[in-house]
Amino acid sequence: GELETSDVVTVVLGQDAKLPCFYRGDSGEQVGQVAWARVDAGEGAQELALLHSKYGLHVSPAYEGRVEQPPPPRNPLDGSVLLRNAVQADEGEYECRVSTFPAGSFQARLRLRVLVPPLPSLNPGPALEEGQGLTLAASCTAEGSPAPSVTWDTEVKGTTSSRSFKHSRSAAVTSEFHLVPSRSMNGQPLTCVVSHPGLLQDQRITHILHVSFLAEASVRGLEDQNLWHIGREGAMLKCLSEGQPPPSYNWTRLDGPLPSGVRVDGDTLGFPPLTTEHSGIYVCHVSNEFSSRDSQVTVDVLDPQEDSGKQVDLVSAS
């Protein structure tokens, strides 16, 4: 007869490991008992379990409640056992020693490999601002056994660097993604992809990029100067800019306070029926946590009774 087992049994942390040991005997041969022991190098054999044809299953106190026989029906020549809820410390060498009649004793060894799937974490880098040089966008760390693979999935142009730390029973891998921030990256996904033999599918953690910037400001509403005449209703100026975080707007008049009746509504300055009083230099001040911009325009309200038009100046300042 001969023993049938596996060289390596691989199981994911927390799952049950079947340790196979089957005696392929000749007709009439019987298995009296199967002794399972852990036999790591440099240490004596440690009892796991004893399967006896008459006495049944004896489990070592160290493995009490964790070792069982596979569910029925059972072949009397099958000395396999189930190790419940495998933990990392279970990883190692195991031996089954089979006592048969009349052929004598046989033994075989196998290695139990316990895969520890990683639980990845993604940490965003410092705040990204347009105009910075190469900056850390995010780092992704995953620890497992064996060492996981950490890569990045993104449309954003950047560079990656990885480092690994070996522990006694696992390895931690950290990958960093660096980029030169630009406003076009705003809202773009940056995904950390972790691969590991203990995972059914890759684990993905997505971070949305936020790049602080503030565009130049400009004012719209004075495109047709002839519309700005005494008595006109619904005249308005709109301040144009964009930024991250979204900017706030403030209107002032350079040559005095805002005339009465003029309404400020965020980026819009609304006028009552126009009078010559409304002529002046208006300043739109745009700001966010990153920067601030100004744009100023000169409003000249025309008197329709006058023939000659006035020149309108548009000045933008930062």
Partner: antibody
């Protein structure tokens, strides 16, 4: 024929010592686990101590730990129990018994027993 | 330590009666259970090992059953020589422990 014969029992004062012997024959003594089991007058059976074949690892009941010592001489096919600091509650018939080692520290039932030797601890 | 609880502690029966003695372990012991018979002034005698296996030379009227925590010794037809005290013993762990015994007396 398997035989186990105990000797060495007798009357001893509290605090005294006694050495019991168990002579084995009819089987390969060195390959069996051996144990001592006692029975106080009118009481049930109580396991006292055991010794493994091979490396002679020893085991004791809490009630005798530190006072009793089990040993074996495989060349003489003899099991011993050295009893020190004896107490009145150690009064009992002491039996030696054999059991086959299956594996590790797992044994069969004790299939052969000696006839016993009486130990009386009294002043 | 594993506690072994035997019941009843004593019983009276007549020759030819069917007698059942039970033994319960405080935790699972698979089939690492033996039954012994002891007569006054004599050493215990192994009747049943591995919960249900009959020791060589023991009459077939003795039988054992059970596994795990609950075990039974049955004497199918009590004979005069069967009046004695019966003990169960677990040898799953060290220390091996005995039940308190069941005395079978003549009715």
């Amino acid at each position: 024929e398997v035989q186990l014969v105990e000797s060495g029992g007798g009357l001893v004062q509290p605090g005294g010592s006694l050495r019991l012997s168990c002579a084995a024959s009819g089987f390969t003594f060195g390959t069996y686990g051996m144990s001592w089991v006692r029975q106080a007058p009118g009481k049930g059976l109580e396991w006292v101590s055991g010794i493994k074949p091979g490396d002679s690892t020893t085991y004791y009941a809490d009630s005798v730990k530190g006072r009793f010592t089990i040993s074996r001489d495989n060349s003489k096919n003899t099991l011993y129990l050295q009893m020190n600091s004896l107490r009145a509650e150690d009064t009992a018939v002491y039996y030696c018994a054999r059991a086959e080692l299956l594996a590790f520290d797992v044994y069969t039932a004790s299939d052969y027993w000696g006839q016993g030797t009486l130990v009386t601890v009294s002043s | 330590d594993i506690q072994m609880t035997q019941s009843p502690s004593s019983l009276s029966a007549s020759v030819g009666d069917r007698v059942t003695i039970t033994c319960r372990a405080s935790q699972g012991i698979s089939s690492y259970l033996a039954w012994y018979q002891q007569k006054p002034g004599k050493a215990p005698k192994l009747l049943i090992y591995a919960a249900s296996s009959l020791q060589s030379g023991v009459p077939s009227r003795f039988s054992g059953s059970g596994s795990g925590t609950d075990f039974t010794l049955t004497i199918s037809s009590l004979q005069p020589e069967d009046f004695a005290t019966y003990y169960c013993q677990q040898h799953y762990t060290t220390p091996p422990t005995f039940g308190q015994g069941t005395k079978v007396e003549i009715k």
